[in-house]
Amino acid sequence: EAIQVTQPSVVLASSHGVASFPCEYSPSHNTDEVRVTVLRQTNDQMTEVCATTFTEKNTVGFLDYPFCSGTFNESRVNLTIQGLRAVDTGLYLCKVELMYPPPYFVGMGNGTQIYVIDPEPCPDSD
Amino acid sequence: EAIQVTQPSVVLASSHGVASFPCEYSPSHNTDEVRVTVLRQTNDQMTEVCATTFTEKNTVGFLDYPFCSGTFNESRVNLTIQGLRAVDTGLYLCKVELMYPPPYFVGMGNGTQIYVIDPEPCPDSD
């Protein structure tokens, strides 16, 4: 049907609150501009975390988003979400849209469960 | 015969490397001595992490194991594993045996995936 989007089922954020995971799609077609959206699912609600459009020239995305970054290569996007805290633990879905040229295709991954553990504060140095 | 053993599917270890989770079984029967074993599954292999026998009097277990502790109440055991590091991330299964009096029953949970993130070391205080 639509394009197939694959992403890992589980990722652990680092103790700095950084989680990285790939989002791949197939078939890749001959696409000049690809839009990637990261959504967070809570209960039955989806909220957009960040979105960007990659082109052949613009292979680094999410420049408008302080918490997201990503690099694009062929049909794979390496996503990084930073600034995560324990309350941000949840299911993060990768949506891929082949925007240009037509035809338009859209696909959604099954989601990556990101687990975040807040670090213990370091003891004060007297 | 088998008994039904339930345990959570996922638990996050704290930043101190401590993971706690319940292990419950049913039917509980009228049992004086219950043996609880925690096993770690890696690939197709099971290794014993710790084991203890609870009685009406001995409701605190795993005294021989520095990394395990647990309390027993009716048909529920609250398990705690400590000293965990990122390499210990894995599937931990709770096995329950109703040892005495007969009849003997045994059951195994589906496992709890414990995720462990190593904390960043605190900066040295000069």
Epitope: E33, R35, A51, T53, Y100, P102, Y104, V106 | -
Partner: antibody, heavy 115, light 111 residues
């Protein structure tokens, strides 16, 4: 709420040029390709062309090739249609539209080519 | 270019009637299991409104009396029970390849 608003229509002399604008709001403009479509009075819909999200790519219907230019300014959330060498048969309502699985159209702007 | 031919060009019907409009493409508009054929409703002086996308998916907010079917080259828009607000012109559109093309339209009038 997604909105597309066309402007710049009016009366144009045959042989003249027109530049239509389409102001977008309510969404990330730079993320989506936009089309221009026109409709002559009492007639059907006719696709003119498309511009890519970044503005780096355009495609036009054969009949408009060489006479039309679609451009966009992502910093201003605005799309443009330049049509040259106008003739009477270019009289139409011109629409900009975002055509994906959810479609958004502007209200259209009427261009009349007449002397 | 892909040509789209709608039939009939116009029809007269009464409120409550079941109405069927067909759209035939000069070549298949299917690709990777998806049909790139959409249906629009247009009323005089208004912009077109998307009813059905990808041949059979109902656009959000569109009444369920509208349905679409078909694949390849033959497609159908059905209005199960015509309502007064449904009297309008209907267009099919293909978005598989550039140039996008529209059918010539079907005008649904009151009998």
């Amino acid at each position: 709420e997604v909105q597309l608003v066309e402007s710049g229509g009016g009366l144009v002399q045959p042989g003249g040029s027109l530049r239509l604008s389409c102001a977008a709001s309510g969404y990330t403009f730079s993320g989506y390709a936009i089309h221009w479509v026109r409709q002559a009075p009492g007639k059907g819909l006719e696709w003119i062309g498309i511009i890519s999200p970044s503005g780096g790519g355009t495609k036009y219907a054969q009949k408009f090739q060489g006479r039309v230019t679609i451009s966009r300014d992502n910093s201003k959330n605005t799309l443009y249609l330049q049509l040259n060498s106008l003739r009477a048969e270019d009289t139409a309502v011109y629409y900009c539209a975002r055509l994906y699985d959810v479609a958004y159209w502007g209200q259209g702007t009427l261009v009349t080519v007449s002397s | 270019d892909i040509q789209l031919t709608q039939s009939p060009s116009s029809l007269s019907a009464s409120v409550g009637d079941r109405v069927t409009i067909t759209c035939r493409a000069s070549q298949s508009v299917d690709f990777h299991g998806k049909s790139f054929l959409h249906w629009y409703q247009q009323k005089p002086g208004k912009a077109p409104k998307l009813l059905i996308y990808d041949a059979s998916s109902l656009e959000s907010g569109v009444p369920s009396r509208f349905s679409g079917s078909g694949s390849g080259t033959d497609f159908t828009l059905t209005i199960s029970s015509l309502q007064p607000e449904d009297f309008a012109t209907y267009y099919c559109e293909q978005s598989l390849e550039v140039p996008f093309t529209f059918g010539q339209g079907t005008k649904v009038e009151i009998k």
